[in-house]
Interface confidence: low
């Protein structure tokens, strides 16, 4: 493991005094209840804290909310409850913060049962002032801001009405009834599923997908027989009931629903689900659940149209019961994803892909670590990292893996070293190269966060006992120092830092308990004096991402190009600063077979880079449904991976001939029921589809 606190570590000098001068305590003058915290805007320093205490009585819930505001990253808070007329705020809706730096905030109030509608408090000046507005409906969901214009809000009512406001919640108009799910699309478009019979939960598969581009003046039904829909990158997805009525198939549109293609994926039965694990404007990771309650499925990666899919990973863990998957996009390095598989022996094992799902491999264990009791061979094992599944099963894992786009290569995760994920107490592991290599950074479970674009990592031990110590590292987790931030330990509830990992401030939240009272307390620590100077050119070093063999001319090539980054030297203790921008230098690579997906009707045998024809299609014309026509495909089996920028080298030819024969994704139109699909058949049984799982783009 990494040196802990011995002399090898380049210690930060005089850090206790520097941190003590920058530690700010705030005791909140109310009963404990629950607390929620939101940042308003980017780099504004404005934090809103809502504390809620409620007593459920037999007839009603009596509650009290207090609203606090900080404009110095949490060092000081002012009680602004009077700005919301001391109203009880509904915590399940949270604080709806406007996109980017709009400064907009919406709080939804609890109203008495007999009222005509709900009530909101609106601010458009970073919560300096609030306006009370009575709604003509009772909201079912949090207000949804249009990503393009924060004055435009969308809400669903408890009566399943779709309501729109064009003046930041001042006036509302019901634009449609019997709406089940609504989402903002691109350029102010609103997509929603409606059931003209009035039912939502029980009628999935009989819904209409509608679109409005003028905020409800006119509507277009873009698809019928819809089970659900999702948006990811440029893609609009709909799971559609097939002619038989028991199977669903995925249809994809890249023009907001004007035209659809059937995805070449296995259809699923009603006890299975589809889930878009990740999507951008170039491609999609799609999970297709296996029949039965297996708890696993297969990941497929799409082409650039979202229509042709290649099998990426089998036995991908995704529980049917709670909808947990360990799939994580490692945002600190392009093309890297981690997840878990459910092995034949029912053990859960971690795998990582460095090439956007092309190949999945076990995570390399730290060089000096011993294999635990799960290992058959004490010398041969791998690192397994804990994610959503471990948390859901109640293991002592306080946090998901963490990475940030501006902290290049840095990944923090809880894990264990063996043949499978262990139920024993996990440790914290850190990678500084996007998951290729790892060190054990901290013994036991911790909360952790990244500050100053990776210049500082802060951690707090996960303990049931009160705590008063934080740990921090200025060298990407190799060496750690401890700081006692208070004499009186607190029951720790959370670590909060401004999203984006650019801040130098960390807030430690918890409560104190005495014989009679229990109070919320926060400690905000500013690390600016630890990193006392701004980083200069000499503090950075050139680093080639994805480098595994420096002798190889193609070393570092992933998706057709390699990238060199300027990375902060571990020995440099300086501020990247709030304006830090990742400096990178890309260079194009020659094409190889690894830069191509297998085209429709082809697959890659294991440990082979060549695409071979699927046996059941050998000697047949490849016909598949595309853009509403049957296409005749002449191919030698390859299609460029979405986002791959390679040039020259291997260049397999591909040609598509139009057969001019209609074959629309006709499950979308109720009157046509004889579509042809070349997706593999499969699937049986029930209904398990919830959208918007954590960080998952779309879970039916």
């Amino acid at each position: 493991s990494a040196p802990g606190e011995d002399e090898e570590c380049g210690r930060v000098r005089d850090f206790v005094a520097k941190l003590a001068n920058n530690t700010h305590q705030h005791v909140f003058d109310d009963l404990r209840g629950s607390v929620s915290l939101s940042w308003v805007g980017d780099s504004t320093g404005v934090i809103l804290v809502l504390t809620t205490f409620h007593v459920p009585l037999v007839i009603m819930t009596f509650g009290q909310s207090k609203l606090y505001r900080s404009e110095d990253y949490g060092k000081n808070f002012k009680d602004i409850t009077d700005l919301i007329n001391n109203t009880f705020i509904r915590t399940e809706f949270g604080m709806a913060i406007g996109p980017e730096n709009s400064g907009k905030v919406v709080l939804t109030a609890e109203v008495s049962g007999g009222s005509r509608g709900g009530r909101i408090f609106r601010s458009s000046d970073f919560a300096k002032n609030f306006v009370q507005t009575d709604l003509p409906f009772h909201p079912l969901t949090q207000m949804m801001y249009s990503p393009q214009n924060s004055d435009y809000l969308l809400a669903l009512s408890t009566e399943n009405g779709l309501w729109v406001s064009k003046n930041f919640g001042g006036k509302w108009e019901e634009i449609h009834k019997t709406v089940c799910l609504a989402k903002w699309g691109r350029k102010g478009t609103i997509f929603f599923t409606a059931n003209h019979n009035g039912s939502c939960s029980n009628d999935r598969g009989m819904l209409e997908l509608e679109r409005t581009t003028d905020y409800g003046k006119s509507f277009k039904t873009v698809a019928s027989k819809i089970y659900s829909f999702g948006l990811g990158g440029k893609f609009l997805f709909a799971s559609v009931m097939t002619g038989k009525g028991t199977l669903r198939a995925i249809h994809v549109s890249v023009d907001d629903g004007d035209t659809w293609n059937m995805a070449q994926l296995p259809p699923v039965g009603h006890e299975q689900f589809y889930s878009i694990l990740a999507a951008n404007d170039e491609m999609v990771f799609m999970h297709v659940d296996e029949p039965g309650d297996s708890g696993f499925g297969t990941i497929y990666v799409s082409d650039d149209r979202g229509t042709v899919y290649s099998k990426s990973l089998e036995r991908h863990l995704y529980t049917t019961t709670g909808g947990e998957t360990d799939f994580i996009n490692v945002t600190s390095l392009r093309g890297v994803f981690t997840t878990s598989i459910l092995a034949e022996d029912k053990s859960v094992q971690s795998v990582i892909s460095f090439d956007q799902g092309g190949e999945w491999v076990p995570l390399r264990k730290p060089a000096d670590s011993k294999c635990d009791a799960t290992a058959r061979d004490p010398e041969k094992c791998s690192l397994h990292i804990h994610a959503a599944y471990s948390i859901a099963t109640g293991l002592n894992v306080p946090m998901l893996p963490l990475s940030e786009p501006n902290a290049v290569g840095l990944v923090l995760a809880h894990g264990s070293v063996g043949d499978a994920i262990s139920v024993m107490r996990p440790d914290v592991y850190v990678s500084d190269d996007g998951g290729y290599t790892w060190i054990k950074a901290l013994e036991g479970p911790h909360y952790y966060t990244i500050l100053d674009s990776g210049g500082i990592i802060v951690a707090i031990e996960h303990s049931s006992r009160p705590i008063n110590v934080i740990k921090f590292s200025t060298d990407e987790g190799q060496c750690w120092q401890t700081y006692t931030f208070t004499r009186d330990p607190i029951y720790f509830t959370g670590l909060a830092s401004e999203p984006g990992a650019r801040s130098m401030n960390i807030s430690i939240w918890g409560f104190t308990e005495s014989f009679l009272t229990s109070q919320w307390v926060s400690y905000t620590i500013d690390f600016k004096d630890i990193l006392e100077r701004n980083c200069e050119e000499k503090d950075y070093t050139i680093w080639l991402a994805h480098s595994t063999d420096p002798e190889d001319y193609e070393d570092g090539c992933i998706l057709g190009y390699k990238e060199q980054f300027l990375r902060l030297r571990k020995s440099s203790v300086c501020q990247n600063g709030r304006d830090y921008v990742v400096t990178k230098q890309p260079s194009i690579c020659l094409c190889s077979l690894e830069d191509f997906l297998c085209d429709f009707g082809y697959y890659r045998p294991e440990n082979d880079s060549k695409c071979v024809e699927q046996p059941e299609l050998k000697g047949h014309d490849l016909e598949f449904c595309l853009y509403g026509r049957e296409e005749h495909l002449t191919t030698n089996g390859y299609r460029k991976i979405p986002g791959d920028k390679c040039q020259g080298g291997v260049n397999p030819v591909r040609e598509v001939k139009d057969l001019k024969k209609k074959c629309t994704s006709n499950f979308l139109s109720p009157e046509k029921q004889n579509s042809k699909s070349n997706g593999s058949a499969g699937g049986s049984g029930g209904l398990n589809d919830i959208f918007e799982a954590q960080k998952i783009e779309w879970h039916e």
Partner: antibody, heavy 117, light 108 residues
Framework: EVQLLESGGGLVQPGGSLRLSCEAS????????MSWVRQAPGKGLEWVST????????NYTDSVKGRFTISRDNSKNTLYLQMNSLRAEDTAVYYC???WGSGFDYWGQGTLVTVSS | EIVLTQSPATLSLSPGERATLSCRAS??????LAWYQQKPGQAPRLLIY???NRATGIPARFSGSGSGTDFTLTISSLEPEDFAVYYC??????????FGPGTKVDIK
């Protein structure tokens, strides 16, 4: 394999109470709307009550409103029917059923409730 | 409240014959209608849901048709095990259901 197992039936006097339970297995219980349906001896089927997957929405046939309460515990995969102020006309076999589409695709074997003095 | 009427009350047929059962709703239920088969001492079995969709494991000789107020269950060729009571059931609104009085299909 989907299984629904009712319990809690028996003989009760008019005005008395009973609590029926239905233990579910073989499917993702929390994702499904669930119902109770009854059948008086020698008579047809009568829908009694339905509850949404999360338990937030319920409905009852008029004759049991205010007397029966449907509930569910998703952590235990169990559906309940609390029956108060029972009357002779509530005598029936009570079935627990899983909703699918416009119908009920899986049914329990039923539990007999007899209301008699 | 929507009332379902089934006809005939009893249908006497021989094995191999075609059975046509009718269900009429007092007002439109769109296609939200299901059909069940029940044998003495057993729980009902779902045959058809959403007017025309066959449930899992149901033989192809059972088919459903209709929408709005008039619905039909057809058994193309009666097998000995098909003699039972058949119920239609509607869902007029989310979480509200009613059953028809049933049609008994017995051996002539």
């Amino acid at each position: 394999e989907v299984q629904l197992l009712e319990s809690g039936g028996g003989l009760v006097q008019p005005g008395g109470s009973l609590r029926l339970s239905c233990e579910a297995s073989g499917f993702t219980f929390r994702s499904y709307v669930m119902s109770w349906v009854r059948q008086a001896p020698g008579k047809g089927l009568e829908w009694v009550s339905t509850i949404s997957g999360g338990g937030g929405n319920t409905n009852y046939t008029d004759s049991v409103k205010g007397r029966f309460t449907i509930s569910r515990d998703n952590s235990k995969n169990t559906l309940y029917l609390q029956m108060n102020s029972l009357r002779a006309e509530d005598t029936a076999v009570y079935y627990c059923a899983k909703n699918w589409g416009s119908g009920f695709d899986y049914w329990g074997q039923g539990t007999l409730v007899t209301v008699s003095s | 409240e929507i009332v379902l009427t089934q006809s005939p009350a009893t249908l006497s047929l021989s094995p191999g014959e075609r059975a046509t059962l009718s269900c009429r709703a007092s007002q439109s239920v769109s296609s939200y209608l299901a059909w069940y088969q029940q044998k003495p001492g057993q729980a009902p079995r779902l045959l058809i849901y959403d007017a025309s969709n066959r449930a899992t494991g149901i033989p192809a000789r059972f088919s459903g048709s209709g929408s709005g107020t008039d619905f039909t269950l057809t058994i193309s060729s009666l097998e000995p095990e098909d003699f039972a009571v058949y119920y239609c059931q509607q869902r007029s609104n989310w979480l509200i259901f009613t059953f028809g009085p049933g049609t008994k299909v017995d051996i002539k």
